[in-house]
Interface confidence: low
């Protein structure tokens, strides 16, 4: 150990000597001589054991995306972005970190999952937990009262990923929100329409969107005899009904949260109900619930919402579910969550939910929290749970053993004989300049078989083959990789032919 320390000291001193000589602009020979001594000492030292102990890995709760995973991700994003744009949304971006004060007090119990940063500048900073609070801050800061925007970015949560499978500490959110004072339920209905469009387009299986209203929940708790201080904690118990039985939820409310059994039973009568607009009508006639101002407002809005959802042709995908009690503190009105449905084991059984893939709701008070005068900007929005969707799409493609292309290369520029590198370089450059996605192998004289194999592995559909004879005739041999069919194409027509075959528009518009 002492021997190693002595050697380390010698290496350090010799290193300083080399640096000194370089600064003094000493002769190259002298520097070389001293560098050789330094290398010799380093060789004697051998590998640093402490460095060997270092385990190369990504931080807990994060992961790398391979080209294959990125290809899946880009396809998913493309579907989502096209839908957001189809509905007239603008796009914004905000910093990955916010002032800590911006995020505090917005997430209830989830605040403990916020990542704090250390900043030499003296500002207390935190990584964003979601995209909604930064959006509200953006609106308040820019005094905006009206915007329809989407935002796709990474968010950060100090979740314990080991405990919750499929959950990460860094993950993407895809949010769409409408801010502004509009007539009731029209923007809310559009958000639900967008959710359904995206989930249908992604073809990840049958889904159901559960809808409720924070005001109905609060009114229901009030008439059942839950004290104000227990609303939020009872909410979190009720929200577990999609995962556990009513008995377990009741035990938690009574045993752990100190609710009287008869109060829990009254809640149970409501929260176990779900249905469509007929359930809304039924509850509007409920002698107790209809007497509660908040609940009445919520039910009235839901009735209107269902009318619009019918006009949008998605009412069959929506279920009014009184047990939906989404966790975030900032929701004030309609709340919704989309779940994928498993095929029931036997006919006649109810479809089983297998987890949330999108969610959202109305949050009319959030912007007001940032405004010095408390001015409110009503907002409604949705968030697509893309991480979950990525893994579902990946699994589906693996099950189908479908090859996913990780590049978009349309053509490989190849040669059949030696000494044609210059011609290949000229041709690939012509193709790039014309907007064709093209590649070539980085070898002077690659074998034609190797070039064709590369195309098969990478999924490149076409090969443009240059040969001595072709050069004389002014043509290029264009070969389809899958059908192996070859045609001679005049060099000046090559770009057009590749575009025609790969379905690319003929002009780069």
């Amino acid at each position: 150990m002492a021997e190693r320390a002595a050697l380390e000291e010698l290496v350090k001193l010799q290193g300083e000597r080399v640096r000194g000589l370089k600064q003094q602009k000493a002769s190259a020979e002298l520097i070389e001589e001293e560098v050789a001594k330094l290398l010799k000492l380093k060789a004697q030292l051998g590998p640093d054991e402490s460095k060997q102990k270092f385990v190369l890995k990504t931080p807990k709760g994060t992961r790398d995306y391979s080209p294959r995973q990125m290809a899946v991700r880009e396809k998913v994003f493309d579907v989502i972005i096209r839908c957001f744009k189809r509905h007239g949304a603008e796009v914004i971006d905000t910093p990955v970190f916010e002032l800590k004060e911006t995020l505090m007090g917005k997430y209830g119990e989830d605040s403990k999952l916020i990542y704090d940063l250390k900043d030499q500048g003296g500002e207390l900073l935190s990584l964003r937990y979601d995209l909604t609070v930064p959006f509200a801050r953006y609106l308040a800061m820019n005094k905006l009262t009206n915007i329809k925007r989407y935002h796709i970015a990474k968010v950060y949560r100090r979740d314990n990923p080991a405990m919750t499978r499929g959950r990460y500490r860094e993950f993407y959110q895809c949010d769409f929100d409408i801010a502004g004072n509009f007539d009731p339920m029209i923007p809310d209905a559009e958000c639900l329409k967008i959710m359904c469009e995206i989930l249908s387009s992604l073809q990840i299986g049958d889904f159901l969107v559960k809808v409720n209203d924070r005001r109905i929940l609060d009114g229901m708790f009030a008439i059942c005899g839950v004290s104000d201080s227990k609303f939020r904690t009872i909410c979190s118990s009720v929200d577990k009904l999609d995962k556990v039985s009513w008995e377990e939820v009741k035990n938690e409310m009574v045993g752990e949260k100190g609710l009287a059994p008869e109060v829990a039973d009254r809640i149970g009568d409501y929260v176990q109900q779900h249905g469509g607009v007929s359930l809304v009508e039924q509850l509007l006639q409920d002698p107790k619930l209809s007497q509660n101002k908040q609940a009445l407002e919520g039910l009235g809005d839901l009735k209107l919402l269902f009318e619009y959802l019918t006009l949008f042709g998605i009412d069959d995908k929506i279920s009014f579910d009184l047990s939906l009690a989404r966790g975030l503190d900032y929701y004030t009105g309609v709340i919704y969550e989309a779940v994928l449905l498993q095929t029931p084991a036997q006919a006649g059984e109810e479809p089983l939910g297998v987890g949330s893939v999108a969610a959202g709701g109305r949050y009319d008070g959030l912007v007001g929290m940032f405004d010095p005068k408390g001015r409110k900007v009503p907002c409604v929005g949705l968030s697509i749970g893309v991480e979950r969707i990525f893994s579902i799409v990946e699994q589906r493609l693996e099950a189908l053993e479908e090859k996913i292309r990780t590049t978009e290369t349309q053509v490989l520029v190849a040669s059949a004989q030696k000494k044609l590198l210059e011609e290949r370089l000229k041709l690939v450059s012509e193709l790039w300049d014309a907007g064709i996605k093209a590649e070539l192998l980085y070898k002077k004289n690659p074998k034609l078989l190797n070039q064709l194999q590369y195309c098969e592995e990478a999924g490149i559909p076409l090969v443009a083959i240059i040969g001595e004879q072709e050069l004389k005739d002014g043509v290029i041999k264009l070969r389809s990789v899958t059908s192996r069919e070859e045609v001679d194409v005049r060099r000046e027509d090559l770009v057009e032919e590749i575009k025609r075959r790969t379905g690319q528009p003929l002009c780069i518009c």
């Epitope: 800590k100 505090m104 007090g105 119990e109 250390k118 030499q120 207390l124 503190d329």
Partner: antibody, heavy 122, light 110 residues
Framework: QVQLVQSGAEVKKPGASVKVSCKAS????????IGWIRQAPGQGLEWMGD????????NDNEKFKDRATMTADTSTSTAYMELSSLRSEDTAVYYC???????????????WGQGTSVTVSS | DIVMTQSPDSLAVSLGERATINCQSQ?????????MHWYQQKPGQPPKLLIK???NLESGVPDRFSGSGSGTDFTLTISSLQAEDVATYYC?????????FGGGTKLEIK
């Protein structure tokens, strides 16, 4: 197991400096911050600041900013706190403690050194 | 700096009885604030972490200790006092630099 072992008691004259060491073992030294807390005789606890050996970043209590210097030597897994211009009211037991979290500004201190008694007297 | 006001300064409780210590933090506006920690210190020993983030029991700490509260008011409760619980108890916040501690509550057996 995690251990923080501090240097021995010191007696100093007013105006002098004292350097207290805290040797850590049983965990990866660069992953956690080390805080310094002092306790005057019969008094409560006072946080002086902390250092995060991973990036040598320090948080300082303004009260001690000009007099307390926190450093860390990653090769020996040892943190140091030097307090200069000592006065009689600096007589206290000085503790080092590990920040319970690796992440920024939310530290509870989960492991403590045994304390180093510093007496300032002419 | 955030001032932490601990009460009472001292407390005498019979063995097996409940002991409650309060801590109030000033100048923290948000109700979701829970960056409050509790320590136990016995004479001649360094402090020992009992509760972190208002209510999370540190591993190895007996479950007769519990913490509650959010916003500005926090409580440490010992449900059934044992002889080995005689000590001084401190609260500490980690909301902003500098961390500050409460003045301490000396707990004795009645």
């Amino acid at each position: 197991q995690v251990q923080l072992v501090q240097s021995g008691a010191e007696v100093k004259k007013p105006g002098a400096s004292v350097k207290v060491s805290c040797k850590a073992s049983g965990y990866t030294f660069t992953d956690y911050c080390i805080g310094w807390i002092r306790q005057a005789p019969g008094q409560g606890l006072e946080w002086m600041g902390d250092i995060c050996p991973g990036d040598a970043y320090t948080n300082d209590n303004e009260k001690f900013k000009d007099r307390a210097t926190m450093t860390a030597d990653t090769s020996t897994s040892t943190a140091y706190m030097e307090l200069s211009s000592l006065r009689s009211e600096d007589t206290a037991v000085y503790y080092c403690a590990r920040g319970e979290e690796q992440l920024g500004l939310r530290n509870a201190m989960d492991y403590w050194g045994q304390g180093t008694s510093v007496t300032v007297s002419s | 700096d955030i001032v932490m006001t601990q009460s009472p300064d001292s407390l005498a409780v019979s063995l097996g009885e409940r002991a409650t210590i309060n801590c109030q933090s000033q100048s923290v506006s948000t109700s979701t604030y829970n960056y409050m920690h509790w320590y136990q210190q016995k004479p001649g020993q360094p402090p020992k972490l009992l509760i972190k983030y208002a209510s999370n029991l540190e591993s190895g700490v007996p479950d007769r200790f519990s913490g509650s509260g959010s916003g500005t008011d926090f409580t440490l409760t010992i449900s059934s006092l044992q002889a080995e619980d005689v000590a001084t108890y401190y609260c500490q916040h980690s909301w902003e630099i500098p961390w500050t501690f409460g003045g301490g509550t000396k707990l004795e057996i009645k």
